[in-house]
C-alpha cells in the first residue's frame, strides 16, 4: 500500500500508485546538508553522490560511541524521502550530500556556511540544471546564515529548510527565518500540526507551507534494505524539496519566486486545524499543505499572488511595520491589521527602487502588521496614486487615471489617532472600478498597474455591524490582488488576504459599542491576465492545467 | 532581513578613535556590530564569523584576517584563521578570545561579526 504521506501529496484526481510523472525530477540536482549517509542503501543506491565535504563539530561526551548506522540515520532517511525508489517523492532526482551534522545530529552555523559556499563554488565550476538545496536543520536566529542563504538564492538556487521542531515562532530560528528560503512546517495524517514529545512543529509568518512530517517511512541505515518511520520538520522539508525537484524538472526555467507561488497555489487549503497554534500566531501561519501539481505542464496562464506578513511593529506610538515582496514579485496591494484596532492604516511607498507596504501603529495600540499582496505579473508597470485627506464630507477618493492602468489595491493612512465612528457616506465605486474611496480624514493610496492583458474588477460584501469577520472571495479564474475595508472606521481591526478570500476583521462585539447602522464592507479587487492565459495556450495548445477547486495563495515572511 | 525582529541579540561595540593607527580606518559614522545567538546553550564562544562589506575582494579578506592576527599577537593573543570565505559572503572564520572583539570590529571592511553557534537536525 502507498504510504500516507505520498498519498497526501498526490493531486486530488490521481491515485498515488498511478501518478507517475515522466521524469520524476531527473533534470534537477538536490543538495542535502545533513549527517553522513548510507548511499549504497537499496532505496537510494546510485542516486546520491557523497561529496568529500565534511565540516562537523566533535561529538559531545566522553562515552559517545560512533556507531555508523546512528551517524547515518537522519541523512539516509531524508535522502530516501526525497528520491527513494519505493518511498521517495522525486524518484528521478539525483542528490549530492554534504556532511554538516555529526553523529549526534549537531552542527555549526560556520560549518553550514562553508557548506553553502562549497555548493556555490561547485555551481560556478560546473553549471548544471536547476539546483535545490535541502537544509533539514535549525539553529537560533543567525544574521550570517540568513545572508548566505539570500546570496545563494539570488544565484538561482532553490533553498528548502525545516521550520524547526521547537513549537515556536519559526522567525526565531535560522535558516527558517530567511525570507528567500522555502520554510516548511510539519503536519500528520490527520492534517494536524505535528507534536514531537512536549514540542512540535514551528509556525508563524516565516513558514511558507506545511508538508507531511509524522510517521514518514523512509530508508533506514540499520541495514541496506531496511525502512524506518521518522518524524519532524526535516521530513516535511524533504517532501517539499522533492516536489520542487519535480516542478523544476517539468519547467527548468522557473525562478524561485515562480516556484514558491506554484508550491503555494497547488497546496491543499484550509485543512490544518489551527487551534493547535497559539492564538496570536493563527492569522500569521499559512494553512497550506504541499502537494504535487496535477500536471507536469506549466501553469503559466494563472495570475499568482501570495500574502506576506511583516514582523510585528511593536507598541510604541510611531512604530511602523514593513512587508516586502521578493525581488521579482510586484506589490499589488497593501493592508494592515492590529489586534487592538488601534492603528493608523497603511501606505505603499518606494524603498530602494521597490514598493513596500508600511503599516502605522496608533497611540495606545499594541502594534500593527503590514500585509503585502505579492504577485507574479510579467512586464508590469505599477505606481501608487495618493489623495490627501478630503475636507468634504464626501470622503477621500483616488483613481487610476493613466491610460491602460487598472486598480489592483487600495490603502488608507491617517494621522489622526482615531477616525471616529462618524462615517462618510459609503459611496460605492460602481461604474468606476479604478477608484478607491475612503474616510475624509485619511489619505488614500491606489495601486495602479499596467500589464499586458491585465483586467481587474471590484467585488464587495457588506454586512451590518457588529460582526467580527466579513469576507468576500474572487471567483474561479480570478485572483485576489487587493483587500480592504469600507469604511476605515475605528472598530475595524484590519483587512488581509487568505488564499483568494479578502477577510475584514472587526472588534469583538462586546467591546465596540457600535451601532447596528454601521456596515462593514469587505472590498476585494480580483484580477486576471488574458495575456498569460493566451501565452500558455499557445505553448500547450490548450489550457489543461486548471485546478479543480479554487486558486490558492498564502503568505511568506520578511 | 530587517533587524526589526529583535530575534537575536545585537551588541554594538563603539569605535574608539585612539585605536593603533589603522591605515584604512572605517568610513566615518559606520559601526560594525556584533551578533550572537539568543539561545545561550547554543552559543559557541571562541569562534567568530567576521563578515566583510559586500564588495570586499578575497585578497582584502585575507589581508584583514592577517591584520587581525598581527594586532592580536601584539596584545599577546593567539588567533587561528579557520576559513576565508569568498563566493557567497566575503569574510573569514576565526578562533580567538572574545576579548579581541572590540579590536576586530574596528578593522577595515568589517560589516558585522557573529559568534558561531550550533545547528541541529530537525
Amino acid at each position: 500500500s502507498i504510504p500516507w504521506n505520498l498519498e497526501r501529496i498526490t493531486p486530488p484526481r490521481y491515485r498515488a500508485d498511478e501518478y507517475q510523472p515522466p521524469d520524476g525530477g531527473s533534470l534537477v540536482e538536490v543538495y542535502l546538508l545533513d549527517t553522513s549517509i548510507q548511499s549504497d542503501h537499496r532505496e537510494i543506491e546510485g542516486r546520491v553522490m557523497v561529496t568529500d565535504f565534511e565540516n562537523v563539530p566533535e561529538e559531545d561526551g566522553t562515552r559517545f560511541h560512533r556507531q555508523a548506522s546512528k551517524c547515518d540515520s537522519h541523512g539516509t532517511h531524508l535522502a530516501g524521502v526525497v528520491s527513494g525508489r519505493r518511498a521517495g517523492v522525486a524518484k528521478g532526482a539525483s542528490m549530492r550530500s554534504l556532511r554538516v551534522l555529526n553523529c549526534q545530529g549537531k552542527g555549526t552555523v560556520s560549518g553550514t556556511l562553508i557548506g553553502l559556499e562549497f555548493i556555490r563554488k561547485s555551481q560556478l565550476v560546473q553549471p548544471v540544471g536547476p539546483l535545490v538545496v535541502l537544509l533539514p536543520l535549525a539553529g537560533g536566529y543567525s544574521r550570517v546564515l540568513n545572508a548566505a542563504c539570500q546570496r545563494l538564492a539570488r544565484a538561482g538556487v532553490v533553498l528548502v529548510t525545516a521550520a524547526g521542531n521547537f513549537r515556536d515562532d519559526a522567525c526565531l530560528y535560522s535558516p527558517a527565518s530567511a525570507p528567500e528560503v522555502i520554510t516548511v512546517g510539519a503536519t500528520n495524517a490527520q492534517d494536524q500540526p505535528v507534536t514531537l514529545g512536549t514540542l512540535g512543529t514551528n509556525f508563524g509568518r516565516c513558514v511558507d507551507l506545511f508538508a507531511p512530517g509524522e510517521d514518514i517511512i523512509g530508508a533506514s541505515s540499520d541495514c541496506s534494505t531496511c525502512f524506518v518511520s521518522q518524524s519532524g520538520t526535516s521530513q516535511a522539508a524533504a517532501h517539499v524539496a522533492g516536489i520542487a525537484a519535480m516542478m523544476l524538472s517539468a519547467e527548468p526555467e522557473l525562478t524561485l519566486a515562480e516556484l514558491r507561488q506554484r508550491l503555494i497555489h497547488f497546496s491543499a487549503k484550509d485543512v490544518i486545524n489551527e487551534a493547535w497554534f497559539p492564538e496570536d500566531q493563527r492569522v500569521l501561519t499559512p494553512n497550506l499543505v504541499a502537494a504535487l501539481p496535477p500536471s507536469t505542464h506549466g501553469a503559466g496562464w494563472q495570475l499568482f499572488c501570495r500574502t506576506v506578513w511583516s514582523a510585528h511593529s511593536g507598541p510604541t506610538r510611531m512604530a511602523t511595520a514593513i512587508a516586502r515582496c521578493a525581488p521579482d514579485e510586484e506589490l499589488l496591494s497593501c493592508s494592515s491589521f492590529s489586534r487592538s484596532g488601534k492603528r493608523r492604516g497603511e501606505r505603499m511607498e518606494a524603498q530602494g527602487g521597490k514598493l513596500v507596504c508600511r503599516a502605522h501603529n496608533a497611540f495606545g495600540g499594541e502594534g500593527v502588521y503590514a500585509i503585502a499582496r505579492c504577485c507574479l505579473l510579467p512586464q508590469a508597470n505599477c505606481s501608487v496614486h495618493t489623495a490627501p485627506p478630503a475636507e468634504a464630507s464626501m470622503g477621500t477618493r483616488v483613481h487610476c487615471h493613466q491610460q491602460g492602468h487598472v486598480l489592483t489595491g487600495c490603502s488608507s493612512h491617517w494621522e489622526v489617532e482615531d477616525l471616529g465612528t462618524h462615517k462618510p457616506p459609503v459611496l460605492r465605486p460602481r461604474g468606476q472600478p479604478n477608484q478607491c474611496v475612503g474616510h475624509r480624514e485619511a489619505s488614500i493610496h491606489a495601486s495602479c498597474c499596467h500589464a499586458p492583458g491585465l483586467e481587474c474588477k471590484v467585488k464587495e460584501h457588506g454586512i451590518p455591524a457588529p460582526q467580527e469577520q466579513v469576507t468576500v472571495a474572487c471567483e474561479e479564474g480570478w485572483t485576489l490582488t487587493g483587500c480592504s475595508a469600507l469604511p476605515g472606521t475605528s472598530h475595524v481591526l484590519g483587512a488581509y488576504a487568505v488564499d483568494n478570500t479578502c477577510v475584514v476583521r472587526s472588534r469583538d462585539v462586546s467591546t465596540t459599542g457600535s451601532t447596528s447602522e454601521e456596515a462593514v464592507t469587505a472590498v476585494a479587487i480580483c484580477c486576471r491576465s488574458r495575456h498569460l492565459a493566451q501565452a500558455s495556450q499557445e505553448l500547450q495548445g490548450s489550457s489543461d492545467y486548471k485546478d479543480d477547486d479554487k486558486h490558492h495563495h498564502h503568505h511568506h515572511h520578511h | 532581513q530587517e533587524d526589526e525582529d529583535g530575534d537575536y541579540e545585537e551588541l554594538v561595540l563603539a569605535l574608539r578613535s585612539e585605536e593603533d593607527g589603522l591605515a584604512e580606518a572605517p568610513e566615518h559614522g559606520t559601526t560594525a556590530t556584533f551578533h550572537r545567538c539568543a539561545k545561550d546553550p547554543w552559543r559557541l564562544p571562541g569562534t567568530y564569523v567576521v563578515v566583510l562589506k559586500e564588495e570586499t575582494h578575497l585578497s582584502q579578506s585575507e589581508r584583514t584576517a592577517r591584520r587581525l592576527q598581527a594586532q592580536a599577537a601584539r596584545r599577546g593573543y593567539l588567533t587561528k584563521i579557520l576559513h576565508v570565505f569568498h563566493g557567497l559572503l566575503p569574510g573569514f572564520l576565526v578562533k580567538m578570545s572574545g576579548d579581541l572583539l572590540e579590536l576586530a570590529l574596528k578593522l577595515p571592511h568589517v560589516d558585522y561579526i557573529e559568534e558561531d553557534s550550533s545547528v541541529f537536525a530537525q
Partner: antibody, heavy 115, light 109 residues
Framework: QVQLVQSGAEVKKPGASVKVSCKAS????????ISWVRQAPGQGLEWMGW????????NYAQKLQGRGTMTTDPSTSTAYMELRSLRSDDTAVYYC????????WGQGTTVTVSS | QSALTQPASVSGSPGQSITISCTGT?????????VSWYQQHPGKAPKLMIY???NRPSGVSNRFSGSKSGNTASLTISGLQAEDEADYYC?????????FGGGTKLTVL
C-alpha cells in the same frame, strides 16, 4: 569506464573453501555495494547476497545458510565472496555485479567442485 | 525465495514483436517498481536491458521496452533481430533480498 574484474577459475574438492575476488573501478565505490550471483551449468541466475563498500554490511540470501561470507576492502577497491564446505552442487559460474541494481557485471569466475 | 515465473521459451521471426512475461507476487513484482530484465548470450555475463520496470540504460536499443501490471512484468522486443537470440531473465526486489526468474530462451526463427 565502470568495470568489475574477477579472479580466475578455481577447482576445489568437496568440503574445501573458495574465495572469489572482484575489483571495482570507474565509479564512486561507496555509492554501490556488490551483489554476488551464481549460475549452475544449464541453470538460471541465483542471487547470493550483497556486501557494502561503505561499511562492510552484508545481506545474504537465506539459501547460503552461513556457508558464505562476503567482505570488501575499500583500500584496494575489491570485494570478496568466500564459500565454505563446498559441495558438488556449488559448481557454477560466480558473478559479481554492481549494487542491487546489478547494472554492471564482472566477467564471471568458474568454480568447479569435484573429487 | 521462490523464483519468478517466466515461460521457458518463446520464439519469433525477424521483424516480429514478442513479449516475455514474468509473474511474481505482491511481495516482489507487485510490491516494487524495481523489476529489471537481463539478456545473456551463451558463455557471457548477463547484460542489463531494462531497469525499474520500464527504463532503458543508455546504449540499449529502443526496440526493448518493459511494463508492469499487478504482479506481472513484461519485456517486449519489437522488430526482432537475429542477435536478440539469447536467454532473458527478470529480476525483482523482495522485502529484504532479490529474486530472479527462471529464464526464457528466445529463439529467432
Amino acid at each position: 569506464q565502470v568495470q568489475l574484474v574477477q579472479s580466475g577459475a578455481e577447482v576445489k574438492k568437496p568440503g574445501a573453501s573458495v574465495k572469489v575476488s572482484c575489483k571495482a573501478s570507474g565509479y564512486t565505490l561507496t555509492s554501490y555495494g556488490i551483489s554476488w550471483v551464481r549460475q549452475a551449468p544449464g541453470q538460471g541466475l541465483e542471487w547470493m547476497g550483497w556486501v557494502s563498500f561503505y561499511n562492510g554490511n552484508t545481506n545474504y540470501a537465506q539459501k547460503l545458510q552461513g556457508r558464505g561470507t562476503m567482505t570488501t576492502d575499500p583500500s584496494t577497491s575489491t570485494a570478496y565472496m568466500e564459500l565454505r564446505s563446498l559441495r558438488s552442487d556449488d559448481t557454477a559460474v560466480y558473478y559479481c555485479a554492481r549494487g542491487y541494481g546489478m547494472d554492471v557485471w564482472g566477467q564471471g569466475t568458474t568454480v568447479t567442485v569435484s573429487s | 525465495q521462490s523464483a519468478l515465473t517466466q515461460p521457458a521459451s518463446v520464439s519469433g521471426s525477424p521483424g516480429q514483436s514478442i513479449t516475455i512475461s514474468c509473474t511474481g507476487t505482491s511481495s516482489d513484482v507487485g510490491g516494487y517498481n524495481s523489476v529489471s530484465w537481463y539478456q545473456q548470450h551463451p558463455g557471457k555475463a548477463p547484460k542489463l536491458m531494462i531497469y525499474e520496470v520500464s527504463n532503458r540504460p543508455s546504449g540499449v536499443s529502443n526496440r526493448f521496452s518493459g511494463s508492469k501490471s499487478g504482479n506481472t512484468a513484461s519485456l517486449t522486443i519489437s522488430g526482432l533481430q537475429a542477435e536478440d537470440e539469447a536467454d532473458y531473465y527478470c529480476n525483482s526486489y523482495t522485502s529484504t533480498s532479490m529474486v530472479f526468474g527462471g529464464g526464457t530462451k528466445l529463439t529467432v526463427l
